[in-house]
């Protein structure tokens, strides 16, 4: 059976035998030997005491002495199974082996969990030589054991191509609970459930958990490890922890903070980026999301004229990036403008609305009715239109751009004149007779020059005609203009 | 399925003591609190502690110390309530009722009738 | 300790009516439970942790509140629903029942 001793065993050898292990890291030693780490071994050695060999693997040497004697067998006498000690605690353990003097050149390797420890370890191997034999005693040491420590240590042996392997020596380090799952931080929907995980082991086990909610503990007796805490649901913000408990004392998990998901705060700080006349690009800053993302916002625009219906239009855009060109919009006009995003719990309230206006722009229509007729007397071509909708002027008119093409004999130019914005008619110069005259009108302001009227053309005769009749931009829904005479 | 039985009511007299026990089934005993529970003639529930089966150790509501222990005998999963020196301000209903997470009292005894009457 | 105060003490409905039951607390507390009570009966656990049915329970309960004010609600009362309604804390030992609300057949 495998010998166990705990940490807590009284300062004495505990087992028969020449040379036991370390039972336990705190005892006065009786007799010292020179170790690397200036660690002092536990229990006393006397190597040369007949020991027990043990029943594991052991090598029949093929050598006889003088007498003809066949050698004993060869094996590592037993020491302690099982070693128990707290965290950061010094342990010190051996093996040893009485070998027969024909035998030079062995050396004692140590392994843990089937590897073997090269390098840095506090291992020191020391020889008593006898007359026959030589014990030989391999220490292992760890000056402050961690977790990582935990596992089967063994010594093995070669000699004359046999390997020789001692029991294992199985070190156990206990020590407060370690967490391997811990809850996490979450956002929650108010009133529904929801699940934390708590898991910690030892050694020792068991491990036990409470579950902690804003202090107050949640489970009134212990729960084995893992441990799944269901939340029937909060309605504020709640902070969670676990407290998992063995033999050696508790550890207390980080407390998370679950947050109840809400309607995200209202966007702040609208600011105009740029006006066009028929456009404003805004941005905002989002509010507080209210623990859930954004998923979309409304851009809400109404007009500041009093006289207007009140109206709101409303435009849809993605969260990101918090910009938005509003379109479609009047030139020369007063807008209000409100933004409010949404994330899967609601809308926010609005902004607080910010006045925004367009700038002047090119009018959106031509001139209307423009009528064109040839005064033959004063030889001049007269021209008459109306005026575009003022909504649709988009600014102050500033005047109106006339152009005239004459058209002769495949001869063609055109002309353009400037004429203020007062009345709403003009007189050109006849430029060629036997012509075609065509002509367009463009109204102007500062956004600048809105588009041509449907094109009217008139015939200037040659001299000596009698009459003409004026022409006309077409009545809308014909398709050409008409030309009469 | 879950079960909290209660022993018969009792009649007593001023001074003497009296043991209710409340016998657990269809779960495991010490993975659940006891708690104890007083209903006097005509008015209300009143919390009067728990056992922790798991430790047993007890935890005593303000006005139920001294005169009242709550003891436990897991190997036959039975939380007890015994009340010395009795007083006639003592005939009440008694209930024990399993203690779920959040002290919530998921399955209750049918309750004992503790009569102290001279 | 967490003094809990039931309202109104009794409340006298027909079948089929609405009741509400309030219950407030002293301080603040995570959790609301709720049980039901008929005479020479052990009280039986109606909603768990504020708003969660117990189980048999039927859905004409229902449960809300948070912070100090706690309501129960029967929908539409049943004969079978005429009884005394105790609430209970969770937050802070000791553990505190209120005073009960009667519901009686009006």
């Known amino acids: 059976a495998i010998t166990e001793a705990r940490e807590e065993a009284k300062p004495y050898p505990l087992f028969p035998g020449p040379f036991p292990g370390s039972l336990q890291t705190d005892h006065t030693p009786l007799l010292s030997l020179p170790h690397a780490s200036g660690y002092q071994p536990a229990l006393m050695f006397s190597p040369t005491q007949p020991g027990r060999p043990h029943t594991g693997n052991v090598a029949i040497p093929q050598v006889t002495s003088v007498e003809s004697k066949p050698l004993p067998p060869l094996a590592f006498k037993h020491t302690v199974g099982h070693i128990i000690l707290s965290e950061h605690k010094g342990v010190k353990f051996n093996c040893s082996i009485s070998v027969p003097n024909i035998y030079q050149d062995t050396t004692i390797s140590w392994w843990k969990d089937g590897k073997e420890l090269l390098g840095a370890h506090h291992a020191i191997t020391q020889f008593y030589p006898d007359d026959e034999v030589t014990a030989i005693i391999a220490s292992f040491s760890i000056t402050s054991v961690q977790r990582s420590d935990n596992g089967s240590y063994i010594c093995k042996m070669k000699i004359n191509n046999e390997e020789i392997v001692s029991d294992p020596i199985y070190i156990e380090v206990q020590g407060l609970p370690h967490f391997t799952k811990q809850p996490e931080s979450m956002n929650v929907t108010r009133n529904t459930a929801f699940n934390l995980t708590c898991q910690a082991v030892g050694p020792p086990e068991p491990v036990n958990i409470f579950w902690v909610q804003n202090s107050s503990r949640v489970n009134e007796q212990p729960e084995k490890s893992p441990s799944v805490l269901t939340v029937p649901g909060l309605t504020e913000m709640a902070v969670f922890s676990c407290e998992a408990h063995n033999d050696k004392g508790l550890t207390v998990s980080k407390g998370v903070q679950i947050n109840i998901k809400a309607i995200p705060s209202p966007p702040t700080e609208v600011s105009i980026r740029n006006s066009t006349a028929h456009s404003i690009l805004i941005s905002w800053v989002p509010g507080f999301d209210g623990y859930s993302p954004f998923r979309n916002c409304s851009i809400q625009v109404k007009e500041a004229d009093p006289l207007s219906n009140g109206s709101v239009m409303i435009f849809n855009t993605s969260a990101l990036p918090h910009l938005y060109q509003i379109k479609q919009l009047q030139a020369l006009a007063n807008y209000s403008i409100g933004v409010s995003c949404m994330n899967e719990i609601g809308w926010s309230a609005v902004s607080p609305w910010i006045l925004a206006s367009t700038t002047e722009g090119a009018p959106s229509v031509a001139p209307l009715n423009v009528t064109v007729f040839l005064n033959e007397s004063s030889d001049n071509v007269d021209i008459r239109w109306m005026k575009p909708p003022t909504k649709q002027q988009d600014g102050e008119l500033v005047g109106y751009r006339i152009s005239h093409v004459w058209q002769s004999a495949g001869i063609s130019k055109e002309l353009l004149e400037e004429v203020g914005q007062n009345g709403s008619r003009a007189r050109i110069s006849v430029q060629v007779h036997n012509a075609t005259c065509t002509v367009r009108i463009a109204a102007v302001t500062r956004g600048g020059v809105g588009p041509f009227s449907d094109p009217v053309k008139i015939f200037i005769p040659a001299h000596g005609w009698v009459d003409y009749a004026p022409s006309s931009t077409p009545a809308p829904g014909n398709a050409d203009p008409v030309l009469i005479i | 399925q879950v079960q909290l039985v209660q022993s018969g009511s009792e009649l007593k007299k001023p001074g003497a003591s009296v043991k209710v026990s409340c016998k657990a089934s269809g779960y495991t005993f010490t993975n659940y609190g006891v708690h104890w529970v007083r209903q006097a003639p005509g008015q209300g529930l009143e919390w009067m502690g728990w056992?922790?089966?798991?430790?047993?150790?007890?935890t005593y509501a303000q006005g139920f110390t001294g005169r009242f222990v709550f003891s436990l005998d897991t190997s036959v999963s039975t939380a007890y309530l015994q009340i010395s020196s009795l007083k006639a301000e003592d005939t009440a209903v008694y209930y024990c009722a399993r203690g779920n997470r959040y002290a919530y009292m998921d399955y209750w005894g049918q309750g004992t009738l503790v009569t102290v009457s001279s | 300790e967490i003094v809990l105060t039931q309202s109104p003490a009794t409340l006298s409905l027909s079948p089929g009516e609405r009741a509400t039951l309030s219950c407030r607390a002293s301080s603040s507390v995570s959790y609301m439970h709720w049980y039901q009570q008929k005479p020479g009966q052990a009280p039986r656990p109606l909603i768990y942790a504020t708003s969660n049915l117990a189980s048999g329970i039927p859905a004409r309960f229902s449960g809300s509140g948070s912070g100090t004010s706690y309501t129960l609600t029967i929908s539409s009362l049943e004969p079978e629903d005429f009884a005394v309604y105790y609430c209970q804390q969770w937050s802070s030992n000791p553990r505190t029942f209120g005073g009960g609300t009667k519901v009686e057949i009006k």
């Open positions: 056992g922790n089966t798991y430790t047993g150790e007890p």
